[in-house]
Interface confidence: low
């Protein structure tokens, strides 16, 4: 905390308009406390939450908020279905603005935003939208929180039946029901750019009182993808006057902001008022301290399917403040190469950044399917031996993944390594979110719009006259799911391996919760058909005796192409592009940026938000992903992996699941669950095409030369 | 009325520590966040640092090692160390007020510096 | 670093009405406050957070504020008025704090 002057965060953004005098006609609600004498209350101090009630009665009452939420002891209400969204896709008027209020910053709301279901009592309107942070670097900041796990930044919507109200304040002031959402926001590597208008104005109301209208945004784009899986109960204000009329709405999923954007929050400034005069200081733990549940039953969502991969991917390994902690950056440098027909090699190197040092070993895993089966092996690698590992009695018939996992001291954990598929005979090529087998041309009117081309200058090697093929996959799992030691054949997905369609002694499918944890979205695939990964020997035929070696020439291709890549947030929430912002644009290659312009421009056959991941359908178990829950059920269970002990060789049996998977919806902004389409005639891939890699996530840096194609991806 | 003083200006030596005390009559240091500001002579004003009713303090990055402001419910005193020709100056205590200003301001005492 | 600018010097006729400017990249986040000092004597708070006048202030000075300027008008400028005005704001991150004056504007009234 701090008090002070007339000094304040200095922020270098471009000019943000302030409000005019003769403009602020809306500003009522939030100036009605110095108009009509309201209590002064604050978030510490002789003002504090524990003395609201002296100034403010229903402050002590027995159902107020904020609660934590305990999944668990929740129930499913099936009167808690869908939420019904009007006006949340448009963008908002320039007469929308934001105002510090010196407790929180809030946005006025000037358009038409409506929400009904959710077993509200009517059609709410949108008033305004509140946050609350913490103090720093990610602390908790959240009001409300979920088995104990509290977000950084909370961002509240309230809603008042305009039906009934004139006006959201006249609500409050009789003592009638008001609607409220909760929506976490969660440390991610990447700006979100949908919240790119709400950081500006931050940057504009950085001292108490100031206003500031907002550059458009898409009030949709603040809330998560999957809105199907959220919380009800019936609470509070968690401000005075606390009236116990909030309905309350909290997601379940969160929503990514990065470090540079939280930096914003942390910069706004109050007033504080001590005795009879007030001192400036940063407005920071802006949250009420959480309040007894008493009486209360808090209700879970029975949108169908909404909680499938709830549990696994979100509670156990949380994305909250205090979630698993990761050592170190992957290990980097993913390679396999053959020693023989029967034995390969892995090679990595350390990873770049070693948070807590120091690495003890390496933990490699890796999976392999035959005969309907998946078998799983982990085992051990010091660290101050050649970072390799050879797999002996390899079948050329089955389909094996690797990844590796620095280990630290008390069990700390790296993320883990980029997922490499290897299989010989067959190429499978990982995009978006299918699998691909190379060279079988089949007709789909829209999956050029998923798939890119590969280039004919891909190259098959072979060894012992066994041809092999490989592919690197985006897994890239963060912190979020590093710390659950999750086997490699829990981690590929269903749809990964439905998408190859193998027969006879392949694999169907594999189970929903099976790797990779996060596939490239949408937004990604649309960048990737402007880098078609161009698959060379060299990359990996020789990786040479130095697994340490710098990349190869390939390698530092792709690593500077990668920069395009919006890559998804830890909290797997969402791939976020910033196209005409991102400054690391100036540093791509001309072919990459050609291509990106090809992407820009290109027809779309089937258009998706850039927000939105090509893997929001509700079915499909990609732990961390923002998943939309329209789609239609199938018959996945929600399997979750077993834990590792890396220390151990294990071997565990995952069986199969067959899976369909369908298009259903029709909404381009949001498309559903991805289809298992075939390839259309117009996705030609060579013959030969042996070995691609495709990007990696957001801190792999590996990879394979990036350049430009005809094709395009939305 | 309320109005401030500075104590403890005087001429010194370089590399010279020397401490600047500051009293306030007609209200309580204790509420307010108190700033020290400097002027060389014939130049403009230039914040030092600020330090918050809760004791935490904020300086300019020049000031930052040298200089440290700090705190009874009586006085606010600021240490410099090391000082150089350069610090000569007219040192004010300022009370912080209306949210966003320096609304009150000592007479000012002057520190010279000089071998 | 952060800099507010201000001009070195200003004239205005007794009587006149003058205007002081103050600029600077990004103040239009942050409030501006404006200080009159008196040779030989401590600086005294005209304007704070762009346009409040603390008690005492006589309401020929007055504050605005548009887009990155920060602006001090005195009307019916008095001989009584010739002095150094400084504005300040601030520069800074959530980790950094710093106070910013401006150079100041010296104010002659002639005539």
């Known amino acids: 905390v701090l008090h002070y002057v007339v000094c304040f965060p200095a922020l270098t953004e471009g000019y943000v308009g302030t409000l005019q005098e003769s403009r602020q006609d809306s500003s009522v609600q939030i100036r009605r406390r110095k108009a009509s004498g309201d209590p002064y209350w604050a978030y510490s101090g002789a003002y504090g939450p524990e003395h609201w009630v002296t100034s403010s009665v229903s402050c002590g009452g027995s159902h107020q908020s904020p609660i934590d939420i305990l999944d668990h002891h929740a129930r499913v209400g099936d009167e808690y279905q869908e939420l019904q969204l009007d006006g949340f896709d448009n963008e908002s008027s320039n007469k929308t603005w934001m105002k510090n209020t010196g407790k929180t910053v809030a946005i006025l709301l000037k358009d038409d935003y409506f929400v009904s279901g959710a077993g509200l009592p009517g059609r709410f309107k949108a008033e305004k939208v509140e946050f609350h942070w913490g103090h720093s670097n990610g602390s908790a900041g959240s009001e409300h929180s979920v088995n104990g796990r509290r977000f950084p930044v909370e961002m509240q919507i309230f809603f008042y039946n305009p039906d009934d109200f004139d006006s959201f304040q006249t609500a409050i002031s009789e003592n009638r029901i008001i609607g409220a959402m909760a929506i976490f926001f969660q440390v991610s590597p990447r700006d979100n750019s949908a919240l790119d208008p709400i950081i500006h104005g931050l940057k504009g109301v950085v001292h108490h009182e100031k206003e500031t209208f907002l550059d458009p945004f898409i009030l949709r784009d603040l809330l998560p993808a999957s809105l199907g899986s959220y919380y009800r109960y019936t609470g509070s204000l968690t401000t005075p006057p606390c009236s116990e009329i909030v309905e309350w709405i909290v997601f379940r999923r969160p929503v990514p902001i990065s470090y540079h954007q939280l930096e914003a929050f942390y910069s706004i400034f109050t007033t504080e008022q001590q005795d009879h005069v007030k001192s400036v200081e940063y407005l920071r733990n802006n949250f009420r301290p959480q309040q007894a549940l008493n009486d209360r039953v808090v209700s879970k969502s029975a949108v169908r399917d909404a909680w499938n991969h709830d549990l696994a991917d979100f509670l156990d390994n949380p994305l909250g403040t205090e979630a698993s902690k990761v050592c170190s950056s992957p290990p980097i440098h993913m390679k396999v190469q053959p020693l023989n027909q029967t034995a390969l090699q892995v090679s990595w190197s350390q990873p770049e950044t070693i948070y807590h040092p120091p690495i003890m070993n390496y933990m490699i895993s890796y999976s392999w399917t035959k005969n309907e089966d998946e078998k799983e092996k982990t085992f051990t690698k010091d660290s101050d031996k050649d970072l390799k590992a050879t797999i002996s009695h390899v079948s050329p018939d089955s389909l094996y993944l690797f990844r590796v996992q620095a280990v630290c001291r008390n069990d700390m954990r790296s993320d883990f390594s980029q997922t490499m598929l290897f299989q010989a005979n067959t190429t499978r090529i990982f995009q978006g979110t299918r699998i691909v087998k190379t060279g079988v041309p089949t007709a789909s009117p829209a999956s050029s719009a998923d798939m890119a081309p590969i280039s004919s200058g891909s190259s098959t090697w072979t060894s012992s006259g066994i041809p092999f093929s490989f592919v690197s996959m985006a897994t890239g799992m963060g912190p979020s799911s590093s710390g659950s030691q999750a086997t490699v054949a829990s981690v590929v997905t269903s749809t990964l391996l439905a998408g190859l369609g193998f027969g006879g002694g392949g694999i169907s499918s594999f189970p929903s919760t099976v790797w990779p944890t996060r596939l490239p979205t949408a937004s990604a695939a649309s960048k990737q058909a402007g880098r078609t990964v161009l698959a060379t020997t060299e990359a990996l035929a020789s990786p040479g005796p130095d697994v340490h070696s710098a990349p190869s020439k390939d390698s530092e291709g792709t690593e500077e192409g990668e920069k395009e890549e919006k890559s998804e947030s830890e909290d797997g929430e969402r791939e976020h592009e910033e196209e005409e912002k991102d400054s690391e644009k100036k540093e791509k290659s001309e072919a990459t940026h050609t291509a990106a312009e090809s992407d820009r421009t290109a027809p779309a056959p089937t258009p998706s938000s850039p927000h939105r991941t090509a893997a929001e359908g509700g079915h499909q178990t990609i732990p961390g992903r923002r998943q939309d829950h329209s789609a239609p059920a199938t018959d996945q269970p929600g399997h979750v992996a077993p834990d590792l002990d890396p220390l151990v060789d294990t071997a565990t049996q995952v069986p199969p699941t067959a899976t369909e998977e369908h298009y259903s919806g029709s909404d381009p902004r949001r498309p559903e669950m991805p289809s298992k389409k075939p390839m259309s005639r117009g996705d030609r891939f060579s013959e030969d095409s042996k070995f691609i890699t495709v990007n990696p996530a957001e801190k792999n840096t590996s990879g394979m030369l990036s350049r430009p194609s005809p094709g395009r991806m939305e | 009325a309320q109005s401030l003083e500075e104590f403890g200006g005087r001429l010194a030596t370089p590399g010279t520590p020397l401490t600047l005390t500051c009293t306030a009559s007609g209200f309580s240091l204790g509420t307010y966040s108190m700033s020290w500001v400097r002027q060389a002579p014939g130049k403009g004003l230039e914040w030092i640092g600020t330090?918050?009713?809760?004791?935490d303090a904020y300086y300019a990055s020049w000031a930052k090692g040298r200089f440290t402001i700090s705190r009874t419910s009586t006085t606010v005193d600021l240490k410099m160390t090391s000082l150089a020709t350069e610090d000569t100056a007219t040192y004010f205590c300022?009370?912080?007020?209306?949210?966003?200003?320096?609304?009150?301001w000592g007479p000012g005492t002057l520190v010279t510096i000089s071998s | 670093s952060f800099v507010l600018t201000q001009p070195a010097s200003v004239q205005v006729n007794l009587g006149q009405t003058v205007s002081l400017t103050c600029t600077a990249d990004?103040?239009?986040?942050?409030?501006a406050s404006w200080y009159q000092q008196k040779p030989g004597q401590a600086p005294v708070l005209l304007i704070y957070?762009?346009?409040s006048r603390p008690s005492g202030v006589p309401d020929r000075f007055s504050g605005s504020s548009s887009g990155n300027t920060a602006t001090l008008t005195i009307s019916g400028a008095q001989a009584g008025d010739e002095a150094d005005y400084y504005c300040a704001t601030s520069d800074g991150s959530g980790s950094s704090y710093q106070c910013v004056f401006g150079g100041g504007t010296q104010l002659t009234v002639t005539g």
């Open positions: 300022v009370r912080e007020n209306y949210g966003y200003a320096f609304d009150i």
């Open positions: 330090i918050g009713g809760r004791g």
């Open positions: 990004t103040l239009s986040r942050r409030y």
């Open positions: 957070r762009d346009t």
